[in-house]
């Protein structure tokens, strides 16, 4: 991954923090809940983008070259944005305009654009959809996706908080 200009860490921090809040507002649990436990098997590993040790999102990795970590976060945001755009969230029960879900979608797009290098090619994924016999799965799928997104955003927000605290270049006063 080539070294390129750093993002606006402070703005990313603010947006990611807001996203965390929106993700919880969009799907607050009925009872006490810990963030998703991740069962590590090949199927789940390949299906969902996760921020892992080798992604360079630790303090030293961010200091050496933050682009590795930012690329992983970009991939994750694209993955979840794609799911939020799909039939899973478009069908019944319909989502109201300006609902927490709509705000989440807008903010996810905002953070993606902030991190998206101009020349970055758009990844094309097949849109998931539900057959008529699978309609009962929609609320269960929505819940799974939002729980997973909450876990992803919690880590991304910590990355941006660290970046904002340690990697933001100080303003040099002009004479």
């Amino acid at each position: 991954v080539p070294r390129s200009s750093s993002p606006d860490w402070a703005q990313c921090q603010q947006l990611s923090r807001n996203l965390c809040m929106l993700a919880w507002n969009a799907h607050a649990p009925a009872g006490h809940m810990n963030l998703l436990r991740e069962e590590e098997d090949e199927e789940t590993k390949n299906n969902v983008p996760r921020i892992q040790c080798e992604d360079g999102c630790d303090p030293q990795g961010l200091k050496d070259n933050s682009q590795f970590c930012l690329q992983r976060i970009r991939q994750g945001l694209a993955f979840y944005k794609h799911l939020l755009d799909s039939d899973i969230f478009k069908g019944e029960p319909a989502l109201l305009p300006d609902s927490p879900m709509e705000q989440l979608h807008t903010s996810l797009l905002g953070l993606s654009q902030l991190l998206q290098p101009e020349d970055h090619p758009r990844e094309t994924q097949q849109m998931p959809s539900l057959s008529s016999s699978q309609q009962w799965q929609r609320p269960l799928l929505r819940s799974k996706i939002l729980r997973s997104l909450q876990a992803f955003l919690a880590i991304a927000a910590r990355v941006f908080a660290h970046g904002a605290a340690t990697l933001t270049e100080p303003l040099v006063p002009t004479a």
């Epitope: 649990p29 009925a30 998703l36 436990r37 799928l141 799974k144």
Partner: nanobody, 121 residues
Framework: EVQLVESGGGLVQAGGSLRLSCAAS????????MGWFRQAPGKEREFVAA????????YYADSVKGRFTISRDNAKNTVYLQMNSLKPEDTAVYYC??????????????WGQGTQVTVSS
């Protein structure tokens, strides 16, 4: 893998109640959803209700909303289906099932042997 054993089925009059239980054993720490499905003679198996193992979010088929309640007892590794105002059309074999994947699909891969519920008019 998760093993499931259902109990509580039986014969009941229309308007009556039953409570089904499903005890889970094995890899219960990996459970995401526990759900109830049913299959009436000559019909497809259909979704009835589900609950998240952590958090306790509940989901119901429209046909049972307001009449059936799904709940769980994590300490006992058991999920319950309280069925009230039963109708003859609720007659079916009721199956307990588990989705133990955190991936982005709903996959009830482990199933119990089923318990018969018969509602007479």
């Amino acid at each position: 893998e998760v093993q499931l054993v259902e109990s509580g089925g039986g014969l009941v009059q229309a308007g009556g109640s039953l409570r089904l239980s499903c005890a889970a054993s094995g890899r219960t720490f990996s459970i995401y959803y526990m759900g109830w499905f049913r299959q009436a003679p000559g019909k497809e198996r259909e979704f009835v209700a589900a609950i998240t193992w952590i958090g306790g979010d509940t989901y119901y088929a429209d046909s049972v909303k307001g009449r059936f309640t799904i709940s769980r007892d994590n300490a006992k590794n058991t999920v319950y289906l309280q069925m009230n105002s039963l109708k003859p059309e609720d007659t079916a074999v009721y199956y307990c099932a588990v989705d133990d994947r955190t991936n982005m699909s709903v996959d009830f891969g482990s199933w119990g042997q089923g318990t018969q519920v018969t509602v007479s008019s």
